[in-house]
């Protein structure tokens, strides 16, 4: 069964900067990745970025840079300008659409006792939804 993992880390040099790392573990090719915060995509979450292997990437503030790390993993840099709720208490969700498996989504957040530079373990918190 395919799995999605999510890691959230605070940057050691910039306490208002965070990076979300997401990856897809499974066969098939990724056709679209959607990153949201505050909840899953389509279920109360706010879209932060979409990444397509050919059409490119798009992000919305407070996201700053969305990029592919490998063919099956992405990273999203965020900057907390104070205009939005603090990232430390926020859930980030990544949804991977792949062919022929469908859509798989997991969520993660910064561990409560996180030191800068430390990341959440790459344990998927699966949302049981395969579209």
């Amino acid at each position: 069964t395919p799995e999605v993992w999510v890691q959230v880390q605070m940057e050691a040099t910039e306490l208002s900067s965070f990076t979300v790392h997401c990856g897809f573990l499974g066969p098939g090719s990724i056709s679209l990745v959607t990153v949201s915060w505050g909840g899953p995509d389509g279920a109360g979450g706010t879209k932060l970025a979409v990444l397509h292997p050919e059409l490119g990437t798009r992000q919305w503030a407070p996201a700053r840079q969305a990029r592919w790390e490998t063919q099956s993993s992405i990273s999203l840099a965020l900057e907390d300008s104070g205009a939005s709720s603090p990232f430390a208490n926020t859930t980030f969700c990544c949804k991977f659409a792949s062919f022929p498996e469908g859509s798989w989504e997991s969520c993660g957040s910064l561990p409560p006792s996180s030191d800068p530079g430390l990341s959440a373990p790459p344990t998927p918190v699966p949302i049981l939804r395969a579209d």
Partner: antibody, heavy 119, light 106 residues
Framework: QVHLHQSGPELVKPGASVKISCKAS????????INWVKQRPGQGLEWIGW????????YYNEKFKGRATLTVDKSSSTAYMLLNSLTSEDSAVYFC????????????WGQGTTLTVSS | DIQMTQSPSSLSASLGGKVTITCKAS??????IAWYQHKPGKSPRLLIH???TLQAGIPSRFSGSGSGRDYSFSISNLEPEDSATYYC????????FGGGTKLEIK
Amino acid sequence: QVHLHQSGPELVKPGASVKISCKASGYTFTAYYINWVKQRPGQGLEWIGWIFPGSDSTYYNEKFKGRATLTVDKSSSTAYMLLNSLTSEDSAVYFCARDGELRGPFDYWGQGTTLTVSS
Amino acid sequence: DIQMTQSPSSLSASLGGKVTITCKASQDINKYIAWYQHKPGKSPRLLIHYTSTLQAGIPSRFSGSGSGRDYSFSISNLEPEDSATYYCLQYDNLLTFGGGTKLEIK
């Protein structure tokens, strides 16, 4: 077919408030950001802010913070912009526009709502 | 906030000719620039996004290029209906429009 239909022209007095609507159809309303744009007579376009209907999350141009309030009604697929403490500087055409994500920002626009602030 | 300086503010060109409009950003916008056509009494129309990607249904005589802070937009084989005001929009960091360029076809 994606369509954004805005409410009609408004004539209001200085100091009053106005609420402009933008009814969306032809796509999943909660999945795309809605933006609002201002154009004063003879001037250029100015971004006011956006709202993500799926979560009611908003982001404003600093210039419009505290003056504009963006909301949505998911049940009717309608976005609203409330402008308060109006002055003659607010007389303008206001557009709503959908963010098309990978198809580009502002891929579909409403027809515009003319606001006239005059005593 | 990112500022977009668009030039020229107006220009006049001949039917069948070519024009180029430029936009300079106050910082690198990573190719996140779009171009719009706006005619009086109408809604703006998206022509190009991500520097050079033509929107569906837009003729290939419209084109865009650039990187970093400097971007340009061109229209070749000018037609009478190209008379309009054109705007650039950066969407790398929030959204900022350029000041607009009013194009008149002679």
